[in-house]
């Protein structure tokens, strides 16, 4: 997250970190069910661990943390690397979470976002770009949903209805390491960090997010079919 600020503790209990060995964060994710996460499809890896209820990026033990294995990864069937359409994936955890103030699911919004909606994006991704500098703790950033026209103007021929753009002023954006993390608007999950320009936070080049309102049926049906 570029030019965000430290999230208040306990305010993002649905935020997950996807980790490679040894404790290497590569993507964010979102708890949407006691045993299921949503993340970006481009975050798919064979072997990874899931950390929930953790505030700092470092692997130091925190009393609220819960660790899991991903036992099943189900990318949306319409996703195809290196494209960005349909960029979402469900991950089944090896067991159900223990609900606490630090670990709790969030509901996925069935309403599509309108331009001007204020949202919060969070993650442990780099705070500088193109340099790489990671934060000590989870970062939060207020962003506004942009109109689809502004989105298409920013990225000609690259935007479809499975995406929406959001941003703030130049210099504020999600970035590498934030993929799959939550965009929360009006208390529900509206999007996932997906892609954007490089370096991050360039003028008139907003972040692009997976438009989850288009996928509520697929999410529900997939969880039911695999539970």
């Amino acid at each position: 997250i570029i030019n965000g600020s430290d999230c208040d503790m306990h305010t993002q209990p649905w935020q997950a970190a996807l980790l490679l060995r040894p404790n290497q964060l590569y993507c964010g994710a979102v708890l949407v069910h006691p045993q299921w996460l949503l993340t970006a499809a481009h975050c798919r890896k064979k072997v990874f661990r899931v950390r929930l209820g953790h505030y700092s990026l470092s692997p130091v033990y925190e009393s609220g943390q819960q660790m899991f294995q991903g036992v099943k990864s189900i990318p949306h069937p319409g996703y195809s690397h290196p494209g960005h359409s349909n960029d979402l994936m469900l991950i089944k955890l090896n067991r159900r979470i223990r609900p606490t103030k630090d670990v709790r699911p969030i509901n996925v919004s069935s309403h599509c976002p309108s331009a001007g909606t204020k949202c919060l994006v969070s993650g442990w991704g780099t705070t500088k770009s193109p340099q790489v500098h990671f934060p000590k703790v989870l970062q939060c950033l207020n962003i506004s949903v942009l109109s689809q026209k502004r989105c298409e103007d920013a990225y000609p021929r690259q935007i479809d209805d499975t995406m929406f753009c959001a941003g703030d002023k130049a210099g504020r954006d999600s970035c590498q390491g934030d993929s799959g993390g939550p965009v929360v608007c009006n208390g529900s999950l509206q999007g996932l960090v997906s892609w954007g320009d490089y370096p991050c936070a360039r003028p008139n080049r907003p972040g692009v997010y997976t438009n989850l309102c288009k996928f509520t049926k697929w999410i529900q049906e997939t969880i039911q079919a695999n539970s």
Epitope: Q24, C27, H42, G125, P130, S174, Q176, D178, V193, R202
Partner: antibody, heavy 126, light 107 residues
Framework: EVQLVESGGGLVQPGGSLRLSCAAS????????MNWVRQAPGKGLEWVSY????????DYADSVKGRFTISRDNAKNSLYLQMNSLRAEDTAVYYC???????????????????WGQGTTVTVSS | DIQMTQSPSSVSASVGDRVTITCRAS??????LAWYQQKPGKAPKLLIY???SLQSGVPSRFSGSGSGTDFTLTISSLQPEDFATYYC?????????FGGGTKVEIK
Amino acid sequence: EVQLVESGGGLVQPGGSLRLSCAASGFTFGSYAMNWVRQAPGKGLEWVSYISSSSSFIDYADSVKGRFTISRDNAKNSLYLQMNSLRAEDTAVYYCARDLTSMQSRDYYYYGMDVWGQGTTVTVSS
Amino acid sequence: DIQMTQSPSSVSASVGDRVTITCRASQGISSWLAWYQQKPGKAPKLLIYAASSLQSGVPSRFSGSGSGTDFTLTISSLQPEDFATYYCQQVPIFPYTFGGGTKVEIK
């Protein structure tokens, strides 16, 4: 078949210019960042330049900064390297290489260069 | 810039031998290291990415390990087609830099 084919190499005098081209086929060229890498006779690999998929980010090795310019035309599936003020030490085989890392995607995961051309030889000599 | 130091610069080995090549970065690069194989007159070929992930089509006798500053490429049982030069490359930080190379020769 995924393929990169370089062209444009040749013999040039010190201070001269050359333009290298790299034609891509078999993949969605506009979705990938690209690199130029060179190898002087009997020496190791030296990274020369990088260009992101949308051309929004470009970087160069210090040894070529201010003299070389990387560019691309996604509509033509082509990558270019304009080389000016050439020096004897620029003599090398020049490879274009596809970068498997998508800097547009916001995961923190880096791969490397997975597809390389056969190379084109640049000789700078009087 | 990050310096990549490979050792040894050359190694003589026989078919069936276990060969280990090391690469050291001048600063931490997490797991973001790639290994390449290059045969004379040919372009390099990606073998391993993210320090330990095998690129599609690469034989399982090749393996990589390490994180931070110290990395290793291991060929568990050297085959005739493995005689080549091997390079490491750090990929997260510009300028990208390669190690000096390790030539694996027939003993």
